[in-house]
């Protein structure tokens, strides 16, 4: 008759929570029998992030510090199941928690916008197309943002049209700009729950062109045409 | 990036034996168990069993029991299928694939064919 | 062991259409359930796992829903690239099966 390693109840062992959940809460469970009916110790191994700790008797899993998503899930920890007494033989397992996304990443624009620039003067009103993203993970549709100008004053020389969940155009209302640069600032709300707002700032530049580019005298860059 | 690069197809008689390879790179060979999946022509997927590199340990399909042996080198970050005593409905393509929650990464699948 | 029914077996759809894919475990499997798309002569792709998580770089056109035996895979809007085979799978406990695939094929 040889002794036999504990057997757990399941392959693996999930389970999901919120990425917000208190430190302290019960986030899963794993159970393992014994063969001869020895008593089971519980134990983690793995544990990179200092995330989990495991309660020895019960095998269940509690938080121990804040969770975030964005470090990666699911998460994932062996669990390790050991005989009380007679051979101390264990088995492993996987535990795997899965963290469900919180709206905890503000928007923000997409790639770097400096080198903006229409030519001066304009010869008619003109647009820019931008793109905003954040960190946050949109289960089953993308990112649906919406644009709005940072402040009031900006809305005589400019408007935002929203052309997608991800894009928005800048436009001039007009023609009359001096030859210097403007920072536009653009509000991006996320529309999550709870809505995150960022207030992101946009360059552009009023500059003479020499064969579409921004004329600089020497030492300074050639900007791209943008619009 | 993780990648799983399995060996050459294989032709064999009846009663033989074969040994597929996988050579796992681009992650941490011994933190994930690795299995073994086969596809025969015009089938679904069959799960043979799985290795876990860090222990050693293996369980297998009780269809597979007596035939099959599992094993892995992390010298070279490679495990190893052999399937014994061949007959001509395991003439499949055998997988390896990584396990998490479900199979994330999978080998490009290695066609054994059991022929007289 | 655990047997996983999936239907349709076969299935005929436009670019544009939504569809859907079922699959019923012969007992509770707690959405220990992942969902595959394989196409010939590669590799199964892994979409979803725990019944309903996206898995990363999967476009948000694929979700998963349901619990306990009963479970579905849809795709919101079929894109060209689509058209393949669709597995499930159960990981509760081994030996892990998978359901018989449910070929979708171009109308």
């Known amino acids: 008759d040889v002794n036999e390693a504990p057997q757990f109840s399941q392959h693996v062992f999930q389970a999901k929570v919120s990425e917000d959940v208190a430190i302290g809460t019960k986030v899963g469970n794993v159970t393992a029998k014994d063969p001869e009916g020895l008593d089971i110790s519980y134990s983690l191994r793995g544990d990179t992030r200092g995330w989990l700790k495991i309660d020895h008797v019960t095998g269940e899993i509690f938080s121990v510090a804040p969770l975030d998503r964005e470090a990666g899930s699911p998460y994932r920890v062996q669990v390790v199941a050991t005989e009380v007494g007679g051979s101390s033989l264990s088995s492993v397992s996987e535990f795997h928690l899965i963290l469900m996304d919180v709206n905890d990443n503000p928007p923000r624009l997409a790639k770097d916008y400096t080198g903006l620039f229409f030519c001066h003067p304009l010869s008619a009103p003109g647009s820019l197309i931008f793109e905003a993203t954040d960190d946050d993970q949109h289960l089953f549709r993308g990112p649906h943002f919406t644009f709005s100008l940072g402040s009031g004053s900006l809305q005589n020389d400019w408007e935002v049209s929203k052309i997608n969940g991800t894009h928005a155009r800048l436009s001039t209302r007009h023609t009359e700009f001096e030859e210097r640069e403007y920072v536009v600032l653009i509000r991006i709300n996320d529309g999550g729950r709870p809505p995150l707002e960022g207030i992101v700032s946009l360059p552009v530049t009023f500059c003479s062109c020499v064969e579409g580019s921004c004329f600089r005298p020497a030492g300074h860059k050639h900007h791209h045409h943008h619009h | 990036q993780v990648q799983l690069v399995q060996s050459g197809a294989e032709v064999k008689k009846p009663g033989a034996s074969v040994k597929v390879s996988c050579k796992a790179s681009?992650?941490?060979?011994?933190?994930?168990?690795m299995h073994w999946m086969r596809q025969a022509p015009g089938q679904g997927q069959e799960w043979m069993g799985y290795i876990n590199p860090s222990t050693d340990y293996t369980e297998y399909n009780q269809k597979f029991k007596d035939r099959v042996t599992m094993t892995r080198d992390t010298s070279t970050s490679t495990v190893y299928m052999e399937l014994s005593s061949l007959r001509s409905e395991d003439t499949a393509v055998y997988y390896c694939?990584?396990?998490?929650?479900?199979?994330?990464?999978w080998g490009q699948g290695t066609l054994v064919t059991v022929s007289s | 062991d655990i047997q996983m029914t999936q239907s349709p077996s076969s299935l005929s759809a436009s670019v544009g259409d939504r569809v859907t894919i079922t699959c019923r475990a012969s007992e509770n499997i707690d959405s220990y359930l992942a969902w595959y798309q394989h196409k010939p002569g590669k590799a199964p792709k892994l979409l979803l796992y725990?019944?309903?998580v996206l898995e990363s770089g999967v476009p948000s056109r694929f979700s998963g829903s349901g619990s306990g035996t009963d479970y579905t895979l849809t795709i919101s809007s079929l894109q060209p690239e689509d058209f393949a085979r669709y597995y499930c799978q159960h990981y509760y406990r081994t030996p892990l099966t998978f359901g018989q695939g449910t070929k979708l094929e171009i109308k």
């Open positions: 681009g992650y941490s060979f011994s933190s994930y168990w």
């Open positions: 725990a019944a309903t």
């Open positions: 694939a990584r396990s998490r929650l479900g199979f994330d990464y």
